[in-house]
């Protein structure tokens, strides 16, 4: 192999170790934490990314605020169990044998239980609402320009097929991006909306997972779009199962 191949990197995942030991001396990359081979032509699954993040030095993280309307990721970071395809296993447990069921984006969707807890299937998150508030600007962004730029971003940067960006809503200073992807719609090779949303979330926080990136440089007609607050809501194909105690708390 060439000297250049010794310097191989994974553009879509900086939390990897790469070496030219693939077929024909091609660059092959493995995720930190799990050691699983990743496909650098597309996004790495959120499960493998969380696992890699837990194996790296700990970073502080601000938890999003809870909501009555949908699931939000209030449990923060945990070291997940991933299946051989890199997806979240339906049941997750911690070191103290406390277990819970998660959806396809790894967000808890049941009360916590013990090792006897059963999670029959991995329930798909089919609708993600990304709620952003941008910093004050001289005037409102043009809605169609904003819509076009966000759709371009999800297509080009996150490799998400345009049909999965259902809508972009804008009422200054709030921007809402709706991602929808049913099981029946997702073809082989399609990026999962949960993975795209996670990459976007990390980009917005200035913790880009892409090689060579610090954060996200977003501009609409040359005007910087700076996000000051992000909230992500997850809606599952099957409603979550929480006890009434939690719902009335």
């Amino acid at each position: 192999h060439t000297a250049a191949q010794d310097n191989c990197t994974c553009p879509t995942n900086k939390m990897t170790v790469c070496s030219p030991d693939g077929p024909g001396g091609r660059c092959q990359c493995r995720a930190l934490g799990s050691g699983m081979a990743v496909d650098c032509s597309t996004l790495t699954s959120k499960c493998l990314l969380l696992k890699a993040r837990m194996s790296a030095p700990k970073n502080a993280r601000t938890l999003v605020r809870p909501s009555e309307h949908a699931l939000v990721d209030n449990d923060g970071l945990y070291d997940p169990d991933c299946d051989p395809e890199g997806r979240f296993k339906a049941r997750q447990c911690n070191q103290t044998s406390v277990c819970w069921c998660v959806n396809s984006v790894g967000v808890r969707r049941t009360d916590k239980g013990d090792l006897s807890l059963r999670c029959d299937e991995l329930v798909r998150t089919h609708h993600i609402l990304i709620d952003l508030r941008h910093r004050p600007t001289a005037g409102a962004f043009n809605h169609s320009d904003l819509d076009a730029e966000l759709r371009r971003l999800f297509r080009e940067r996150y490799r998400l097929h345009p049909k999965f960006v259902a809508a972009v809503h804008y009422e200054q200073p709030t921007i809402q991006i709706e991602l929808r992807q049913n099981t029946s719609q997702k073809a082989a090779g399609d990026v999962d909306i949960g993975d795209a949303a996670y990459y976007f979330e990390r980009d917005i926080k200035g913790e880009s997972l892409f090689q060579g990136r610090g954060g996200l440089d977003l501009r609409v007609r040359g005007e910087p779009l700076q996000v000051e607050r992000t909230l992500i809501y997850y809606l599952d194909e099957i409603p979550p199962k929480f006890s009434m105690k939690r719902l009335t708390a």
């Epitope: 553009p11 650098c40 032509s41 371009r152 892409f210």
Partner: nanobody, 125 residues
């Protein structure tokens, strides 16, 4: 850090051809690569790009039908074949690599992570 080096520029007569090369210090697999140019006193503009996901290509209207972008991942190099050159093609040509899946007319230059130093192309009789 991916380092990019352009070569192949020079002085050519109108109607002539040049092939620019963009060689990378690391593997270019999975990177979207674009060619840009900056003429004296003008802003840098996109000329062409080749997507990492499906090797689809984009060309600026001003070069469509005359320029061809291609990649050789085994050599970690992207090429820009320039035919039927015109005096208005005179510029410094830069290549850039981005961790994008796709590129298009509307891809901003800031989406590209790594840039070369450029190679001069002069079209003059």
């Amino acid at each position: 850090q991916l380092q990019l080096v352009e070569s192949g520029g020079g002085l050519v007569q109108p109607g002539g051809s040049l092939r620019l090369s963009c060689a990378a210090s690391g593997t270019l697999d999975y990177w979207t690569v674009g060619w840009f140019r900056q003429a004296p006193g003008k802003e840098r503009e996109g000329v062409s790009c080749i997507s990492s996901s499906d090797s689809s290509t984009y060309y600026a209207d001003s070069v469509k039908g005359r320029f061809t972008i291609s990649r050789d991942n085994a050599k970690n190099t992207v090429y820009l074949q320039m035919n039927s050159l015109k005096p208005e093609d005179t510029a410094v040509y830069y290549c850039a690599a981005g961790s994008l899946g796709y590129c298009s007319r509307s891809t901003p230059q800031y989406e590209y992570d790594f840039w070369g130093q450029g190679t001069q192309v002069t079209v003059s009789s």
